[in-house]
Interface confidence: low
C-alpha cells in the first residue's frame, strides 16, 4: 500500500519533496518513492533541510502530534563502513550523488549510533510530536518506521498560476500529491479550481523547448476577475488596493491599465495588464505564444445537490484553509495537503513565465512515472 502524500512541495531549484505517514520497512519506503518517480529523500544542509523542516512543521500526521514519529530518509551506513564518532553524520552517508552543502550544517543525533564496522545500518529522521525535527536516529533497516520522505528532481517547473477569481484550488502532482497550494509545480501537475458559479477549470503544467508553462490557461489568471483589480494574484476591489503605507498594491486586470493617478485602473486600448507595486508600477511583458492574451472560457462543475449552497464562499479565495478538495465528477474526497515551502534562488524565470532550474541531479528521473491514485 502506498498512500498519497500527506504533504509535499517544490522549490525553485527544481526539487520537490513529499512526506508520507505509513508504517513500513526501509525497502518498502524506497520502493514507494520509486513508484512515484522519485527516490528516498536526502536531507542535506541548507535549502533541502529547510524544505523538509517546512513539510514536517506544516502539521502532525495520524495521532495528532501526540508522539514522536520516525521517517525513513536516504541515510545509511554501508556494511564496510565504520561508525565515526567525530563526523557530523557519524560515518553515515546520503545515498545520492547530489552536490551537498556542508555536512556540519545538519541536524544532531538524537541517540549516538552503535559502534560498528560490519553491519549495515539505516537512519531515520525523528520528529518530536511528528512535527518538530529532533534529529537523526540509527535504526535497523528491517524495522518499521512511521513514515518516509521522497525527493523528486525536475529540470523545469511552472510557477503557481495566479488565481484571479478562482477558489478551491487543488493541485495534483505527477508523484501523487493532492494539495491546496504549490509555489512551483512540476510538469504533469494538474490544477483544478472553481470559478464563479462553481464552474470548474483545469490547467496542466507542460514542458517544452522553452521551459514549462500552464497548458489550457486562458490568459494570465485561472479565472477572470469580474472587476478591474488583482492583489497578490487574486481579485480585489479598489478599497483593498492600498497597502499599509498608502501605496497602490494592486495590478490591473486584463483589459485595464493603471490610470494617471497611479492608483486606479482604467480601460486599456492595448488590453495589456500592468503591475502596480508600492512604488512605480511596472508593465507586464507582452503576450507571447506561450502566454496568449486571455480569453474567457467556461468550464463547469455540477456535482452539487439540487438547491444546495456552494461548498466555498465565492469571495473567499484562500487556498490554505480548505478542509477538503473534491476531484471533479467523482464521489471520493482527497485530503488537503498544507504546504509552506520557500522558493530558493537557484533558478531563472523565463519570459514565458516558467522556472528553469540551474541545478542538475541524478537523484531521479526528470519525467516521473505516473502512479495510479486508485491504489493510493
Amino acid at each position: 500500500e502506498h498512500p498519497t502524500a500527506d504533504r509535499a512541495g517544490c522549490s525553485a531549484s527544481g526539487a520537490c519533496y513529499s512526506l508520507h505517514h505509513a508504517t513500513m520497512k526501509r525497502q518498502a519506503a524506497e520502493e514507494a518513492c520509486i513508484l512515484r518517480g522519485g527516490a528516498l529523500s536526502t536531507v542535506r544542509a541548507g535549502a533541502e533541510l529547510r524544505a523538509v523542516l517546512a513539510l514536517l512543521r506544516a502539521g502532525p500526521g495520524p495521532g495528532g502530534g501526540s508522539k514522536d514519529l520516525l521517517f525513513w530518509v536516504a541515510l545509511e551506513r554501508r556494511r564496510s563502513h565504520c561508525t565515526l564518532e567525530n563526523e557530523p553524520l557519524r560515518g553515515f552517508s546520503w545515498l545520492s550523488s547530489d552536490p551537498g552543502g556542508l555536512e556540519s550544517d545538519t541536524l544532531q543525533w538524537v541517540e549516538e549510533p552503535q559502534r560498528s564496522c560490519t553491519a549495515r545500518r539505516c537512519a531515520v529522521l525523528q520528529a518530536t510530536g511528528g512535527v518538530e525535527p529532533a534529529g537523526w536516529k540509527e535504526m535497523r533497516c528491517h524495522l518499521r518506521a512511521n513514515g518516509y520522505l521522497c525527493k523528486y528532481q525536475f529540470e523545469v517547473l511552472c510557477p503557481a498560476p495566479r488565481p484571479g477569481a478562482a477558489s478551491n484550488l487543488s493541485y495534483r502532482a505527477p508523484f501523487q500529491l493532492h494539495s491546496a497550494a504549490l509555489d512551483f509545480s512540476p510538469p504533469g501537475t494538474e490544477v483544478s479550481a472553481l470559478c464563479r458559479g462553481q464552474l470548474p477549470i483545469s490547467v496542466t503544467c507542460i514542458a517544452d523547448e522553452i521551459g514549462a508553462r500552464w497548458d489550457k490557461l486562458s490568459g494570465d489568471v485561472l479565472c477572470p476577475c469580474p472587476g478591474r483589480y488583482l492583489r497578490a494574484g487574486k481579485c480585489a476591489e479598489l478599497p483593498n488596493c492600498l497597502d499599509d503605507l498608502g501605496g497602490f498594491a494592486c495590478e490591473c486586470a486584463t483589459g485595464f491599465e493603471l490610470g494617471k493617478d497611479g492608483r486606479s485602473c482604467v480601460t486599456s486600448g492595448e488590453g495589456q495588464p500592468t503591475l502596480g507595486g508600492t512604488g512605480v508600477p511596472t508593465r507586464r511583458p507582452p503576450a507571447t505564444a506561450t502566454s496568449p492574451v486571455p480569453q474567457r472560457t467556461w468550464p463547469i462543475r455540477v456535482d452539487e445537490k439540487l438547491g444546495e449552497t456552494p461548498l466555498v464562499p465565492e469571495q473567499d479565495n484562500s487556498v490554505t484553509s480548505i478542509p477538503e478538495i473534491p476531484r471533479w465528477g467523482s464521489q471520493s474526497t482527497m485530503s488537503t495537503l498544507q504546504m509552506s515551502l520557500q522558493a530558493e534562488s537557484k533558478a531563472t524565470i523565463t519570459p514565458s513565465g516558467s522556472v528553469i532550474s540551474k541545478f542538475n541531479s541524478t537523484t531521479s528521473s526528470a519525467t516521473p512515472q505516473a502512479f495510479d491514485s486508485s491504489s493510493a
Partner: antibody, heavy 121, light 110 residues
Framework: EVQLLESGGGLVQPGGSLRLSCAAS????????MSWVRQAPGKGLEWVSV????????YYADSVKGRFTISRDNSKNTLYLQMNSLRAEDTAVYYC??????????????WGQGTLVTVSS | QSVLTQPPSASGTPGQRVTISCSGS????????VNWYQQLPGTAPKLLIY???NRPSGVPDRFSGSKSGTSASLAISGLRSEDEADYYC???????????FGGGTKLTVL
C-alpha cells in the same frame, strides 16, 4: 411553479437578425444562471450560450460566437438572445433553460417549451 | 458527429431493464459530471439524472445513472410505455470549452 416561456421565433432570411425572449416566473430570476440550448429539426441538442446571474458575464459556443448575444433584464425577469448574421444551419427550436441552482450554471433543471427559428430564403 | 457517443436506438419490453451508454473522453466525462435528459415526443427536454447518479425530485427511482472512467450509462428498470422517448447525456468538455451533448438515443418500448 417554475415557468419559462420563449417567444420571438419565426422565419428569417440568411444574413438576417432575430431577437428571442424568455419570460421567467416562479423563481428569483436574478439569482440564477440562464442558458440557451437549441435543437435542429430531427437532430440532437446543442448548447448555445449562458449568462451569469451576478455580473452578467456571457459565454458562447464556437458555432455562434460573434453572431449571437445573450442578455438579461432582471427587472423584467426576461432572458434574451439577439441573433445576427443568421445562417441556414441556425434553423432550430431554441430553448431557454435554467441552471441547476443559484450557484451552478449546469445542468439545466428547467426548460421552456421552445420557439422555432427558421432561416431560409 | 457528437462529442459524446450514444447508440442511436434502444428497445425493450415492459418490465424489462434497459441500459443506454454514453462514451466520451478524458476531457469531458473523464473530468466532469454527466447529466441525462429525457425528451418525450413533442416536448422540451427534462433533467433526469445530474452529477452522474443523482435524481432530481420527482424522477422515479427506476432511473439510475453511473459513470466509470470516460463512459457513463443510464439504466431504466421496470420499463414502462411512457418511458418511450429520446435520452441525451451531457457533460462539460475542457478542451472544447463547451457543454456537449450525446447524439441522443431513441428508446422504443415494444
Amino acid at each position: 411553479e417554475v415557468q419559462l416561456l420563449e417567444s420571438g421565433g419565426g422565419l428569417v432570411q440568411p444574413g438576417g437578425s432575430l431577437r428571442l425572449s424568455c419570460a421567467a416566473s416562479g423563481f428569483t430570476f436574478s439569482g440564477y444562471y440562464m442558458s440557451w440550448v437549441r435543437q435542429a429539426p430531427g437532430k440532437g441538442l446543442e448548447w448555445v450560450s449562458v449568462i451569469y446571474s451576478g455580473d452578467g458575464s456571457t459565454y458562447y459556443a464556437d458555432s455562434v460566437k460573434g453572431r449571437f448575444t445573450i442578455s438579461r433584464d432582471n427587472s423584467k425577469n426576461t432572458l434574451y438572445l439577439q441573433m445576427n448574421s443568421l445562417r441556414a444551419e441556425d434553423t432550430a427550436v431554441y430553448y431557454c433553460a435554467r441552471g441547476l441552482n443559484s450557484s451552478s450554471a449546469l445542468p439545466f433543471d428547467y426548460w421552456g417549451q421552445g420557439t422555432l427559428v427558421t432561416v431560409s430564403s | 458527429q457528437s462529442v459524446l457517443t450514444q447508440p442511436p436506438s434502444a428497445s425493450g419490453t415492459p418490465g424489462q431493464r434497459v441500459t443506454i451508454s454514453c462514451s466520451g473522453s478524458s476531457s469531458n466525462i473523464g473530468s466532469n459530471a454527466v447529466n441525462w435528459y429525457q425528451q418525450l415526443p413533442g416536448t422540451a427536454p427534462k433533467l433526469l439524472i445530474y452529477a452522474d447518479s443523482n435524481r432530481p425530485s420527482g424522477v422515479p427511482d427506476r432511473f439510475s445513472g453511473s459513470k466509470s472512467g470516460t463512459s457513463a450509462s443510464l439504466a431504466i428498470s421496470g420499463l414502462r410505455s411512457e418511458d418511450e422517448a429520446d435520452y441525451y447525456c451531457g457533460s462539460w468538455d475542457y478542451s472544447l470549452s463547451a457543454y456537449v451533448f450525446g447524439g441522443g438515443t431513441k428508446l422504443t418500448v415494444l
